[in-house]
């Protein structure tokens, strides 16, 4: 039989940052390959990865055609070498993922704060709007504008000689904080989308960043 | 369901110390913020400090900083109050409540409160 | 640190009244401000977010507004369950500050 000796995949899982998505599964495979196929609820299989000895496919090029579907792969197990016959009708032994809707899913990935400038008693934060894989009229869009008003930056900045945190937050990429004269601040910023329950609710913080180095500008 | 329940309200001499606890259900901690308001009795609401969980950061109002400490361990998913050098001025029911981290976030969720006596 | 002024400290009303109470910030909030309904013994409850937004399964008679750093509560019929004590907030910026509140009390 075609389908002799190979072993179905099994924990097949999801990993997604910022739209980058890839199905991961096991076991990783002794004289077996996989191919994987996606669809949407309502629409037709794709095949992808064909005869892989991976045990990982970047779906990514299909979630971004439209983030708000939810999508469902499976993964079949097919004899090492195997070569695709017209005549063979046996079905090989595959495994559904979970189904997937990147939209509300995918991971926020580390922010990184791109400059803060203070005038007086004001600093203007400005977090770097990530690119993603996701397109309209064939335009990639940045994680602002698949988002819109979902995201929220949490901005924490403290004094450089204490430790309370103090926070702002701001639904678009920018934050203008007041700071007392002569002291020197650091910044750590978090992605969040508030509407969400799950773990994947926050991102990671920013790596900190404090005035008096490159990244700052200070104007009386 | 949402839930946020305090305990360990006491009564206690002043100059001692005491810990309170929120326990939350129905959602996982290091999601969200952590408040701590207290209500003096006949009094308005003053608010103490908040913990992020899923960094530790935190923030306390001039009133309490360097005598009290907000803690979180989510393995519990439970956030602490540990209250040191307590004054009289500190009797108060002690409210914790959640904070979703929108912009608008305002306090949705909040505990029953636990009631501490500073008294001699 | 942020002041909210709150007035009036309490008022006296009946049953159908409209009934005003108002915050003024002491700087800027944008429209992070919320309001809360507090009964005796109980904790606050959420009314009013983000200046002007009812919360989920609060009755339509409370409404929000915003004019600057003027915020306005506005109760359209007092009802009997109404009676209690309102505080504003803002969580513009840390630490976040309340009113003094005003006690809604029955005439």
């Known amino acids: 039989s075609g389908t002799t000796n190979t072993v179905a995949a099994y924990n097949l899982t999801w990993k997604s940052t910022n739209f980058k998505t890839i199905l991961e599964w096991e076991p990783k495979p002794i004289n077996q390959v996989y191919t994987v196929q996606i669809s949407t609820k309502s629409g037709d299989w794709k095949s992808k990865c064909f005869y892989t000895a991976d045990t990982e496919c970047d779906l990514t090029d299909e979630i971004v055609k439209d983030v708000k579907q939810t999508y469902l792969a499976r993964v079949f197990s097919y004899p090492a070498g195997h070569v695709e016959s017209t005549g063979s009708t046996e079905e090989p032994p595959y495994e559904n993922s979970p189904e997937f809707t990147p939209y509300l899913e995918t991971n926020l990935g580390q922010p990184t704060i791109q400059s803060f400038e203070q005038v007086g008693t004001k600093v203007n934060v400005t977090v770097q709007d990530e690119w993603t894989l996701v397109r309209r009229n064939d335009t990639f869009l940045s994680l602002r504008d698949v988002f819109g008003k979902d995201l929220i930056y949490t901005l924490y900045y403290w004094k450089s000689s204490s430790s309370g945190k103090k926070t702002a937050k701001t639904n678009t990429n920018e934050f203008l904080i007041d700071v007392d004269k002569g002291e020197n601040y650091c910044f750590s910023v978090q992605a969040v989308i508030p509407s969400r329950r799950t773990a994947n609710r926050k991102s990671t913080d920013s790596p900190v960043e404090c005035m008096g180095h490159e990244k700052g500008e200070s104007r009386e | 369901e949402v839930q946020l329940v305090e305990s360990g309200g006491d009564l206690v001499r002043p100059g001692g110390s005491l810990r309170l606890s929120c326990a939350a259900s129905g959602f996982t901690i290091s999601y969200y913020i952590i408040h701590w308001v207290r209500q003096a009795p006949g009094k308005g609401l003053e608010w103490v400090g908040y913990?992020?969980?899923?960094?530790?950061?935190?923030y306390y109002a001039d009133s309490v900083k360097g005598r009290f400490t907000i803690s979180a361990d989510t393995s519990k998913n439970t956030a602490y109050l540990q209250m040191n050098s307590l004054r009289a001025e500190d009797t108060a029911v002690y409210y914790c409540a959640r904070d979703d981290q929108s912009v608008s976030s305002p306090f949705e969720y909040w505990g029953q409160g636990t009631l501490v006596t500073v008294s001699s | 640190d942020i002041q909210m002024t709150q007035s009036p400290s309490s008022l006296s009303a009946s049953v159908g009244d409209r009934v005003t109470i108002t915050c003024r910030a002491s700087?800027?909030?944008?429209?992070?401000v919320a309001w809360y309904q507090q009964k005796p013994g109980k904790a606050p409850k959420l009314l009013i977010y983000s200046a002007s937004f009812l919360y989920s399964g609060v009755p339509s008679r409370f409404s929000g507004s915003r004019s600057g750093t003027d915020f306005t509560l506005t109760i359209s019929s007092l009802q009997p369950e109404d009676f209690a004590t309102y505080y504003c907030?803002?969580?513009?910026?840390?630490?976040?500050?309340f009113g003094q509140g005003t006690k809604v009390e029955i005439k």
């Open positions: 700087q800027d909030v944008n429209t992070a």
């Open positions: 907030q803002q969580h513009y910026t840390t630490p976040p500050t």
């Open positions: 913990i992020d969980p899923s960094n530790g950061y935190t």
